[in-house]
């Protein structure tokens, strides 16, 4: 058992038939020494007496908040949570797995620049009794800050017969340094409570490997005089880390056709314009990526050739 | 560079632009099968980061390159020996197409534009390493190319700023 | 073509030192390993160690050791092995061989101890 | 050190019949298992390697299975030509270890 905050505890137990569960004592936080009763929940049923109380931890039945009373007065609350552990893993009830970059992945999260802020999201299926506390570090074992905002309900979408809830929190690395070359990684730690359950989900990464830029801006076309060809040109997005001489971009230039089947033209350039040939009905659409680290491409930025 | 004179910043960019592409595409071609059971104690600790204060944010580049500069030689010189290590040339062979053997010259062609013949700067001692057993060689060949990958791309940051800012 | 050139047969007396030679040839001799292998007449093979001719790092069997010593040469692409203190237990033939896995072995040099 | 033990220690064939070769290590090695012919006053020769991947130039006769500890050389249509001594070894961690051998007779 341990403390999660104050006056609320976590069990670890393992999930297996017939287990024995684990023996909890619980302390009735008052100087008074008698005439002290204890009940769970809403019951008003007597579970003990005395200023400890100790009982066997099995199942969520088991679970909940212990109240500690003197003459009809309450005196200290204890909230039981429970942890379970089934064939040696924890257990990931509450979150969904994204499956994406890889299985088991609960917790993503995308930096638009090396600023040291990024951006963490989960999707749960769960609407209510759900509460997430977000905690972050650079490193473990020497952790240096990272602030967490709380956790908010981002997007509802409907998948299936299913609702599918997304939460996202945003965090800032205190000291950030943008230019130098991460050897620590961030830890990302999220606590999930639904009901009386308690699950906690990790991630781990570098900056480097979440960037995922803005798409480009200020997309435009300028038809070539006699020609078919277009200059494409376009600009950094705001949100990309200056200056642009040092934190470079790359971009892919697409032709795409009406059809999904058309045939894609694509262009790579450095620079932040491109001359290309303009189909009717065509669109050309731009996108970035760090030039010199494959992280993630931005979204594209699309504009019609007509 | 040595002593305070100016790299050829456009050659540097354009060598470890190249650098960043052949770190990348080396990256999957590193051995004869995937990685598996081979667990992930920390092998790559001890390789050299370009640091907070090393001097290499944009700020740091205008007031004294050298600082930089001479991170960046280590951190070359380091890759190098590892590359040339029996890491990669031991078993598991690598495969046919791997770059490797580009991106090991390469490094050896940037740390020399850097300090050319006659001129020496103070080398962080460079670990002797220990033969490796085979069957770690893939994770470490791994992990090194990863941290390759995030070195080298500092290093084209401060080149391709450098051309950009501080040719003269 | 990769080969393995080894230097020819030596006839030695008790106690006394051999150095034979591997001239690698058709490859980049420092980019790969060379293993160093034993096997006396009519029996089995035996690792004896390996170099690596990029940065002259050697592994050696623990029971080769203060009997084997392993050197490169970059400029002629040529590995030596050195057999000091020799004995009958010595009379073998000896191979050098890049890589396991790719199937390049010299031709082997014979060495007989004897009185 | 990790002991490969080869069975059977000779093995006399028909020409045209499948035969297989045993190899066990003293612990798990993985795939990093290598299979070596030597023929008569010849070096050894690569046949397969990492447990079951063909070499270039070698007949597609030969292949090889297994992994951890246990692993197999099978030839599936033994010829006349293929008579000698085959050797599995650990490439998996120092020092190298060779079996001793499976002498391969022709009837």
């Known amino acids: 058992i341990w403390e999660l905050k104050k006056d609320v505890y976590v069990v670890e137990l393992d999930w297996y038939p017939d287990a024995p569960g684990e023996m909890v004592v619980l302390t009735c936080d008052t100087p008074e020494e008698d005439g002290i009763t204890w009940t769970l929940d809403q019951s008003s049923e007597v579970l003990g007496s005395g200023k400890t109380l100790t009982i066997q931890v099995k199942e969520f039945g088991d679970a909940g908040q212990y109240t500690c009373h003197k003459g009809g007065e309450v005196l200290s609350h204890s909230l039981l949570l429970l942890h379970k552990k089934e064939d040696g893993i924890w257990s990931t009830d509450i979150l969904k797995d994204q499956k994406e970059p890889k299985n088991k992945t609960f917790l993503r999260c995308e930096a638009k620049n090396y600023s040291g802020r990024f951006t963490c999201w989960w999707l749960t299926t769960i609407s209510t009794d759900l509460t997430f506390s977000v905690k972050s570090s650079r490193g473990s074992s020497d952790p240096q800050g990272v602030t967490c905002g709380a956790a908010t309900l981002s997007a509802e979408r409907v998948r299936g017969d299913n609702k599918e809830y997304e939460y996202s929190v945003e965090c800032q690395e205190d000291s950030a340094c943008p230019a130098a070359e991460e050897s620590l990684p961030i830890e990302v730690m999220v606590d999930a409570v639904h009901k009386l359950k308690y699950e906690n989900y990790t991630s781990s990464f570098f900056i480097r490997d979440i960037i995922k830029p803005d798409p480009p801006k200020n997309l435009q076309l300028k038809p070539l005089k006699n020609s078919r060809q277009v200059e494409v040109s376009w600009e950094y997005p705001d949100t990309w880390s200056t200056p642009h001489s040092y934190f470079s971009l790359t971009f892919c230039v697409q032709v795409q056709g009406k059809s999904k089947r058309e045939k894609k033209d694509r262009v790579f350039t450095d620079k932040t314009s491109a001359t290309v040939i303009c189909r009717k009905n065509a669109s050309i659409s731009v996108r970035a990526q760090d030039r010199y680290y494959s992280s993630s491409w931005s979204e594209w930025a699309s504009v019609p050739c007509s | 560079v040595p002593g305070g004179s100016s790299p050829a910043w456009t050659q540097c960019q354009q060598l470890s632009q190249k650098l960043c592409t052949l770190a990348w595409s080396a990256h999957p071609l590193v051995g004869h099968m995937d990685l598996r059971e081979e667990g992930d104690e920390e092998t790559t600790n001890d390789v050299p980061h370009i640091q907070c204060g090393d001097g290499c944010d944009p700020q740091g580049l205008r007031d004294n390159s050298q600082f930089c500069l001479q991170r960046i030689h280590q951190g070359l010189i380091f890759y190098e020996k590892l590359l040339g290590s029996d890491i990669f040339t031991g078993e598991p062979s690598l495969l046919p197409d791997s770059p490797v053997g580009q991106l090991h010259a390469s490094l050896l062609g940037l740390s020399q534009l850097l300090q050319p013949e006659g001129h020496h700067w103070e080398t962080q001692q460079i670990p002797s390493l220990s033969p490796s057993q085979p069957w770690q060689r893939l994770l470490l060949r791994f992990k090194i190319l990863r941290s390759l990958q995030a070195f080298v791309a500092v290093a084209a940051r401060v080149f391709a700023h450098g051309a950009a800012t501080l040719s003269p | 073509e990769v080969q393995l050139q080894q230097s020819g047969p030596e006839l030695v007396k008790p106690g006394a030192s051999v150095k034979m030679s591997c001239k690698a040839s058709?490859?980049?001799?420092?980019?790969?390993?060379m293993h160093w292998v034993k096997q006396k007449p009519g029996q089995g093979l035996e690792w004896i160690g390996y170099?690596?001719?990029?940065?002259?790092?050697?592994k050696y069997n623990e029971k080769f050791k203060g009997k084997a010593t392993l050197t490169s040469d970059k400029s002629s692409s040529t590995a030596y092995m050195e057999l000091s203190s020799l004995t009958s237990e010595d009379s073998a033939v000896y191979y050098c061989?890049?890589?396991?896995?790719?199937?390049?072995w010299g031709q082997g040099t014979l060495v007989t101890v004897s009185a | 050190d990790i002991v490969m033990t080869q069975s059977p220690a000779t093995l006399s064939v028909t020409p045209g019949n499948r035969v297989s070769l045993s190899c066990r290590a003293s612990?798990?090695?993985?795939?990093?298992l290598h299979w070596y012919q030597q023929k008569s006053h010849e070096s050894p020769r690569l046949l397969i390697k990492?447990?079951?991947q063909s070499i270039s130039g070698i007949p597609s006769r030969f292949s090889g299975s297994g992994s951890g500890s246990n692993f197999t050389l099978s030839i599936n249509s033994v010829e006349p030509e293929d008579v000698g001594v085959y050797y599995c070894?650990?490439?998996?961690?120092?020092?190298?270890?060779f079996g001793s051998g499976t002498k391969l007779e022709i009837k």
């Open positions: 061989v890049r890589r396991w896995d790719e199937a390049y």
């Open positions: 058709g490859y980049t001799f420092t980019t790969s390993i």
């Open positions: 170099i690596n001719p990029y940065d002259d790092v050697t």
């Open positions: 612990q798990s090695i993985s795939d990093y």
């Open positions: 990492y447990a079951s």
């Open positions: 070894q650990n490439g998996h961690s120092f020092p190298f270890t």
